[in-house]
C-alpha cells in the first residue's frame, strides 16, 4: 500500500481549525491478524530523509496520538489528553486518516508527518509516511479561512518506506 497526501500545503489564519489528511492507497490486507498503526508527528525540513525526525505536536508525542485498528475499521482518539490540547486524530473506512487541530496559533506552523505501519501478529511488516506543511498566518495578509494547495501527483503518492 501507499500513503497519499492530497494537499502538500495548508495556509490558515490564526484561531482557525484545520484538518490535515493522509490517504491509504492500494491493496490493504484485511486479514484478522492484520492491523494498522497510524500516527502523526511534527518534523523539520532540510533533512536527508523527510519525516525521519519526530517532534511532538502541541507537546503530544506520536505515541500519544496513535490509532491502532483493523484494516476495515474506523477509529479516532477519544482520550482526554489529545482533546485537552485541541487535537483529534481519526481514521475512516475509506483509508482517510486525519488530524484536526483546533484554535491554531503561529506556533503550529511547520512540517507535519503521518505514519502508517502494517502490523501482523504484533510485528511491523510495512511502513509508509506522508508529509505536508502548515502555515499559520496573522494580520492583514492572512486568509479568512484555510487555503489548501494540492500536492503534485508525484508528491501525493508519497511512498516512503521508513
Amino acid at each position: 500500500f501507499k500513503v497519499a497526501t492530497p494537499y502538500s500545503l495548508y495556509v490558515c489564519p490564526e484561531g482557525q481549525n484545520v484538518t490535515l489528511t493522509c490517504r491509504l492507497l492500494g491493496p490493504v490486507d484485511k486479514g484478522h491478524d492484520v492491523t494498522f498503526y497510524k500516527t502523526w508527528y511534527r518534523s523539520s525540513r532540510g533533512e536527508v530523509q523527510t519525516c525521519s525526525e519526530r517532534r511532538p505536536i502541541r507537546n503530544l508525542t506520536f505515541q500519544d496520538l496513535h490509532l491502532h485498528h483493523g484494516g476495515h475499521q474506523a477509529a479516532n482518539t477519544s482520550h482526554d489528553l489529545a482533546q485537552r490540547h485541541g487535537l483529534e486524530s481519526a481514521s475512516d473506512h475509506h483509508g482517510n486518516f486525519s488530524i484536526t487541530m483546533r484554535n491554531l496559533t503561529l506556533l503550529d506552523s511547520g512540517l507535519y508527518c503521518c505514519l502508517v505501519v502494517e502490523i501482523r501478529h504484533h510485528h511491523s511488516e510495512h511502513r509508509v509516511h506522508g508529509a505536508m506543511e502548515l502555515q499559520v498566518q496573522t494580520g492583514k495578509d492572512a486568509p479568512s479561512n484555510c487555503v489548501v494547495y494540492p500536492s503534485s501527483s508525484q508528491d501525493s503518492e508519497n511512498i516512503t518506506a521508513a
Epitope: T35, Y37, T39, Q63, D64, H66, L67, H68, H69, G70, Q73, A75, H79, L81, L115, V117, I119, H121, H122, H123, S124, E125, R127
Partner: antibody, heavy 122, light 112 residues
C-alpha cells in the same frame, strides 16, 4: 509509576473456569499490549497470549486457543484472562505483563504483575 | 513450535567472575521484517520475571552494563562480566519472532 496489580489466589475444581484480572496504572492503558504468562510449580515460563487494549485484538498460543479468553475494560484499565475446562496441570502462577512497543511493533515485556496462584484440585 | 534450549541448566559462579548462558532455537528467529525478537529475563527467587535484554543485545533501562547479549539466527548468548550476589535467580531466553512465542527452560545461576 507503571504498575500491574493482579487479583488474588484462586482454588478451583477440575472442569471449572477461572478469571484473573490485571489492573494497570501509571501509563496510557490503550498504548501497550498485555500478555499472559504462566508458571507451573517449580517449572519454567509459558506464554499464553496477548491482548491489545485499544481494540481488543488478541493473539493466542494455539495450545490454549479453545480454552482461553482475554478481554479488557478500558473504563477501569483492567485486562482479564479466563481459562476454562481447568485440569490439575493448569495449577500455576499466572502473570500479566505489559509489552513495550514502538510504532505498534513489539519490543519486549517490560513490566510484570505480581502473579496470581491458581490451584486446580478436586 | 520453536523450541528454545538453554545451557547450562545450572550455573554456580564465584562473585566477581564472568558467567555465560547459551540459548539455541530450533529454527532461525529472524523475523521477515529483519528484526530478531530475542529477549532475556531474570526471575529472582520469589519474584516476577524482569526484563534484562531485548532484540538480542539492547539493555533495558536500569539494567547494569555488566549484562550483555549477543548472537544471531539460532545461537544467542547472555554474558555477565562480573557476577554479583544480587544476580542469583533463573535466567530465561524468549523468542517473540514466531507464534507461539516461547521461553527457554531456564538457567539457574547460584553463587558458589
Amino acid at each position: 509509576q507503571v504498575q500491574l496489580v493482579q487479583s488474588g489466589a484462586e482454588v478451583k475444581k477440575p472442569g471449572a473456569s477461572v478469571k484473573v484480572s490485571c489492573k494497570a496504572s501509571g501509563y496510557t492503558f490503550t498504548s501497550y499490549w498485555i500478555h499472559w504468562v504462566r508458571q507451573a510449580p517449580g517449572q519454567g515460563l509459558e506464554w499464553m497470549g496477548e491482548i491489545n487494549p485499544s481494540n481488543g485484538l488478541t493473539n493466542y498460543n494455539e495450545k490454549f486457543r479453545n480454552r482461553v479468553t482475554m478481554t479488557r475494560d478500558t473504563s477501569t484499565s483492567t485486562v482479564y484472562m479466563e481459562l476454562s475446562s481447568l485440569r490439575s496441570e493448569d495449577t500455576a502462577v499466572y502473570y500479566c505483563a505489559r509489552s513495550y512497543d514502538y510504532d505498534g511493533d513489539y519490543y519486549a515485556m517490560d513490566y510484570w504483575g505480581q502473579g496470581t496462584l491458581v490451584t486446580v484440585s478436586s | 513450535d520453536i523450541v528454545m534450549t538453554q545451557s547450562p541448566l545450572s550455573l554456580p559462579v564465584t562473585p566477581g567472575e564472568p558467567a555465560s548462558i547459551s540459548c539455541r532455537s530450533t529454527q532461525s528467529i529472524v523475523h521477515s521484517n529483519g528484526n530478531t525478537y530475542l529477549e532475556w529475563y531474570l526471575q529472582k527467587p520469589g519474584q516476577s520475571p524482569q526484563l534484562l535484554i531485548y532484540k538480542v543485545s539492547n539493555r533495558f533501562s536500569g539494567v547494569p552494563d555488566r549484562f550483555s547479549g549477543s548472537g544471531s539466527g539460532t545461537d544467542f548468548t547472555l554474558k555477565i562480566s562480573r557476577v554479583e550476589a544480587e544476580d542469583v535467580g533463573v535466567y530465561y531466553c524468549f523468542q517473540a519472532s514466531h507464534v507461539p512465542w516461547t521461553f527457554g527452560q531456564g538457567t539457574k545461576l547460584e553463587i558458589k
